[in-house]
């Protein structure tokens, strides 16, 4: 089996305030087993945007059915974008662990910039 890669095909995405932003991410392999998470920013101060495993993220919807067998697409859409949402978003694969899942690999990141709402 080839080693999993996390692919974020877009280096940057520009969205008008009030619109939805689609952030694309896919895996090249189903192995290892474990959830994916989306973060804004990197390092210790990063902000959790979406956790496939648990949590309530009212502005985030997944583009594909993540429960579907053999799904490799972990793209998300964030609704009602505001200037505060600007930043670099990382799609991160975790390996199932006990007691905690372990970070396995991160995508290269997608920078979200927010344009003023068209008048």
């Amino acid at each position: 089996e080839d080693e999993l890669q996390v692919i974020q095909p877009e280096k940057s995405v520009s969205v008008a305030a009030g619109e939805s932003a689609t952030l694309r991410c896919a895996m090249t392999s189903l192995i290892p087993v474990g959830p994916i998470m989306w973060f804004r920013g990197a390092g210790a101060g990063r902000e959790l945007i979406y956790n496939q495993k648990e949590g309530h993220f009212p502005r985030v919807t997944t583009v594909s059915e993540l429960t579907k067998r053999n799904n490799l697409d972990f793209s998300i859409s964030i609704s009602n974008i505001t200037p505060a949402d600007a930043g670099t978003y990382y799609c991160v694969k975790f390996r199932k662990g006990s007691p905690d899942d372990v970070e396995f690999k991160s995508g290269a990141g997608t920078e979200l910039s927010v344009r003023a709402k068209p008048s």
């Epitope: 095909p9 689609t22 694309r24 896919a26 090249t28 583009v63 059915e65 697409d73």
Partner: antibody, heavy 122, light 108 residues
Framework: EVQLVESGGGLVKPGGSLRLSCAAS????????MNWVRQAPGKGLEWVSA????????YYADSVKGRFTISRDNSKNTLYLQMNSLRAEDTAVYYC???????????????WGQGTTVTVSS | EIVMTQSPGTLSLSPGERATLSCRAS???????LAWYQQKPGQAPRLLIY???SRATGIPDRFSGSGSGTDFTLTISRLEPEDFAVYYC?????????FGGGTKVEIK
């Protein structure tokens, strides 16, 4: 420059065989899934077959399953399509096309060759 | 097998007009797996839109894609002379990776 160049097309009798090749350059061939797509004269596009970057997994349209075999040689940056038991309805221009990302069959095919013509006729 | 149906078969418009092309899937599909291509006579297809709504590299912003579920649309906001061609949608992700039958945009 990213480029795909097909070769191997020609005139063949029904029941005959042909092997198409697609030489890739300008990108890391071994990292991307590859496809064959065909277009019969005056008709639309028909996806024929696909192969993962490593060559471990292959996919076929029902119309060619059991007759066509897709393969690749990453050391030669070349994609192949072995076509056996050819029929008149296989007459078409055959294009090879590269997957847009390293994830096979995710977002489309972003680089295409100019095609090679296969004619099946007695 | 999911069938992709494009309409209309032919669209007759003048340069400067807006073109709206439809692609309908026989069952609901993920927008990540919907692409649009342009093909001119004697040429290979060219990727225009991926993921239903994202423009491929070098594609002018007069081309836009939208839709979800079973209904997808390619819009050309103002037709330029070079836009008269055949347009195909394609479902990816699963096998077979089905193309729609195409829509020809011709000069009125």
């Amino acid at each position: 420059e990213v480029q795909l160049v097909e070769s191997g097309g020609g005139l063949v009798k029904p029941g005959g065989s042909l092997r198409l090749s697609c030489a890739a350059s300008g990108f890391t061939f071994s990292a991307y899934g590859m496809n064959w797509v065909r277009q019969a004269p005056g008709k639309g596009l028909e996806w024929v077959s696909a192969i993962t970057s490593s060559g471990r997994s292959t996919y076929y349209a029902d119309s060619v399953k059991g007759r066509f075999t897709i393969s690749r040689d990453n050391s030669k940056n070349t994609l192949y399509l072995q076509m056996n038991s050819l029929r008149a309805e296989d007459t078409a221009v055959y294009y090879c096309a590269k997957d847009f990302t390293e994830v096979v069959g995710w977002l489309g095919m972003d680089v295409w060759g100019q095609g090679t013509t296969v004619t099946v006729s007695s | 097998e999911i069938v992709m149906t494009q309409s209309p078969g032919t669209l007759s418009l003048s340069p400067g007009e807006r073109a709206t092309l439809s692609c309908r899937a026989s069952q609901s599909v993920s927008s990540s797996y919907l692409a649009w291509y342009q093909q001119k006579p004697g040429q290979a297809p060219r990727l225009l839109i991926y993921g239903a709504s994202s423009r491929a590299t070098g594609i002018p912003d007069r081309f836009s894609g939208s839709g979800s579920g079973t209904d997808f649309t390619l819009t050309i906001s103002r037709l330029e002379p070079e836009d008269f061609a055949v347009y195909y949608c394609q479902l990816l992700g699963s096998s077979p990776r089905t193309f729609g039958g195409g829509t020809k945009v011709e000069i009125k």
